[in-house]
């Protein structure tokens, strides 16, 4: 007969490592005993457990409570065990030493690997703002055993670049994205991916880009100056500017304070009935934490019969 | 620094056996695996097994199961690999290398000529 | 074995152009268990890339790592004379540890 088990046996920190040991005999052969041992230990061999077909699984002190036989249904030949919530202390080569009938000893070694998944954070850059050269918009940091492999998921247009440091048997993955800002980011997620194979699936943490900008502002109202006449009712001005953060919007007269009677709702100016005095030059100051713009109209208030006395003085004159 | 130093160029005749020894400085000899790595003239780099400096215990690739012995002496911070039965084809660059997960570091490599 | 496949065999390649290498995997292997190695004549080879995409320790950052599953990609952004050289790919999440058969990168 002969043993079977694996060079290497992968298990992540925390869970169960199931250590291979299989004696594939002939038929009528029987596996008296299975010892483990951990043979990497310095001192020699130290004894995690011994397995009995008599007289069952006998655990070292040293491993108490650590170590069981796998859940039942078991194969009499199978002299596998399981370490239980493996820590990185546990890595090294262990040793399983079969006892048959009557085929005698047999023994084959293992190497288990302890990975350590990582614990990936994201951390925004500084303020993004229209106008800034390429700028950090995020970095993402993963330290595990092997190394993690972090990337970015986005739909926004950027470079990565990345750094790593080694440790014994570990590493810290920092990668990093720069952006040029502009307002069509907006509200565009950026996501970091860490793959590791002590993951079950890759880690994934979003931030949402926030880039602050103050678009020109113009003034809607006066598109139909026949409109501006004397007497009318409902006249107002609104003041367009988009920004982020959502800006806030002042109107001023540059020639004087603003009429009695003019109400200021946010961005828009609302007039009473016109009267020749709301004619002047209007102010829309819009601004945020990241900038400020001004949009000025000129409002002229016709009088219709200076209009129309006008006109007949014209058709006399002719 | 990390530095790992590997004997010198060797002659053989078809069916004796090389040693072949790599000495590490600069680190923990006992901390880290020990990889064997072959390389035949004009060819690619062939894996061999390792060698774990702090147990002695070994792990080596089938296709040298039964020729291949690695050994360490922890005391002088060396590894050997011997390779016996040596045929014309086992001609190649013997290296060393020291394992964290990849392979961070490599012996300068060892000339093996199988010649009769 | 996990069999490692290269191309192209040889790169062509003018100083200051763009370098872009395959590695592509018979199973799939963990970016973690990847890396890459580069060997000059009569040199031992030298780690550049581990876990598929981090730089090892002085290497300069042209030299750049990607790929998942089972493919990945060693990419130079813009050679220098001292990059032409043979550049080795290599598995090491299970065993037995197996190596791509390389990829020359020449001077054209």
């Known amino acids: 007969g002969e043993l079977e088990t694996s060079d290497v046996v992968t298990v992540v920190l925390g869970q169960d490592a199931k250590l291979p040991c299989f004696y594939r005999g002939d038929s009528g052969e029987q596996v008296g005993q299975v010892a483990w041992a951990r043979v990497d230990a310095g001192e020699g061999a130290q004894e995690l457990a011994l397995l009995h077909s008599k007289y069952g699984l006998h655990v070292s002190p040293a491993y108490e409570g650590r170590v069981e036989q796998p859940p039942p249904p078991r194969n009499p030949l199978d002299g596998s065990v399981l370490l239980r919530n493996a820590v990185q202390a546990d890595e090294g080569e262990y040793e399983c030493r079969v006892s048959t009938f009557p085929a005698g000893s047999f023994q084959a070694r293992l190497r288990l690997r302890v990975l350590v998944p990582p614990l990936p954070s994201l951390n925004p850059g500084p303020a993004l703002e229209e106008g800034q050269g390429l700028t950090l918009a995020a970095s993402c940091t993963a330290e595990g055993s092997p190394a993690p492999s972090v990337t970015w998921d986005t739909e926004v247009k950027g470079t990565t670049s990345s750094r790593s440091f080694k440790h014994s048997r570990s590493a810290a993955v920092t990668s990093e994205f720069h952006l040029v800002p502009s307002r069509s980011m907006n509200g565009q997620p950026l996501t970091c991916v860490v793959s590791h194979p002590g993951l079950l699936q890759d880690q994934r943490i979003t931030h949402i880009l926030h880039v602050s900008f103050l678009a020109e502002a113009s003034v809607r109202g006066l598109e139909d100056q026949n409109l501006w006449h004397i007497g009318r009712e409902g006249a107002m001005l609104k003041c367009l500017s988009e920004g982020q953060p959502p800006p806030s919007y002042n109107w001023t007269r540059l020639d004087g304070p603003l009429p009695s009677g003019v109400r200021v709702d946010g961005d828009t100016l609302g007039f009473p009935p016109l009267t020749t005095e709301h004619s002047g030059i209007y102010v829309c100051h819009v601004s945020n934490e990241f900038s400020s713009r001004d949009s000025q109209v000129t409002v002229d208030v016709l009088d219709p019969q200076e209009d129309s006395g006008k006109q007949v003085d014209l058709v006399s004159a002719s | 620094q990390v530095q790992l130093v590997q004997s010198g160029a060797e002659v053989k005749k078809p069916g004796a056996s090389v040693k072949v020894s790599c000495k590490a400085s600069?680190?923990?000899?006992?901390?880290?695996?020990i990889h064997w790595v072959r390389q035949a003239p004009g060819q690619g780099l062939e894996w061999m097994g390792w060698?774990?400096?702090?147990?002695?215990?070994?792990n080596y690739a089938q296709k040298f199961q039964g020729r291949v012995t690695m050994t360490r002496d922890t005391s002088i911070s060396t590894a050997y690999m011997e390779l016996s039965r040596l045929r014309s084809d086992d001609t190649a660059v013997y290296y060393c290398?020291?394992?964290?997960?990849?392979?961070?570091?490599w012996g300068q490599g060892t000339l093996v000529t199988v010649s009769s | 074995e996990i069999v490692l496949t290269q191309s192209p065999g040889t790169l062509s390649l003018s100083p200051g152009e763009r370098a872009t290498l395959s590695c592509r995997t018979s199973?799939?292997?963990?970016?973690?268990?990847l890396a890459w190695y580069q060997q000059k004549p009569g040199q031992a080879p030298r780690l550049l890339i581990y876990?598929?995409?981090n730089r090892a320790t002085g290497i300069p950052d042209r030299f750049s790592g990607s790929g998942s599953g089972t493919d990945f990609t060693l990419t130079i952004s813009r050679l220098e004379p001292e990059d032409f050289a043979v550049y080795y790919c290599?598995?090491?999440?299970?065993?037995?540890?197996?190596f791509g058969q390389g990829t020359k990168v020449e001077i054209k």
């Open positions: 876990g598929a995409s």
């Open positions: 199973q799939s292997v963990s970016s973690s268990y």
């Open positions: 060698i774990n400096p702090n147990s002695g215990g070994t």
């Open positions: 290599q598995q090491y999440g299970s065993s037995p540890i197996t």
């Open positions: 290398a020291r394992e964290d997960w990849d392979f961070d570091y």
């Open positions: 600069g680190y923990t000899f006992t901390g880290y695996y």
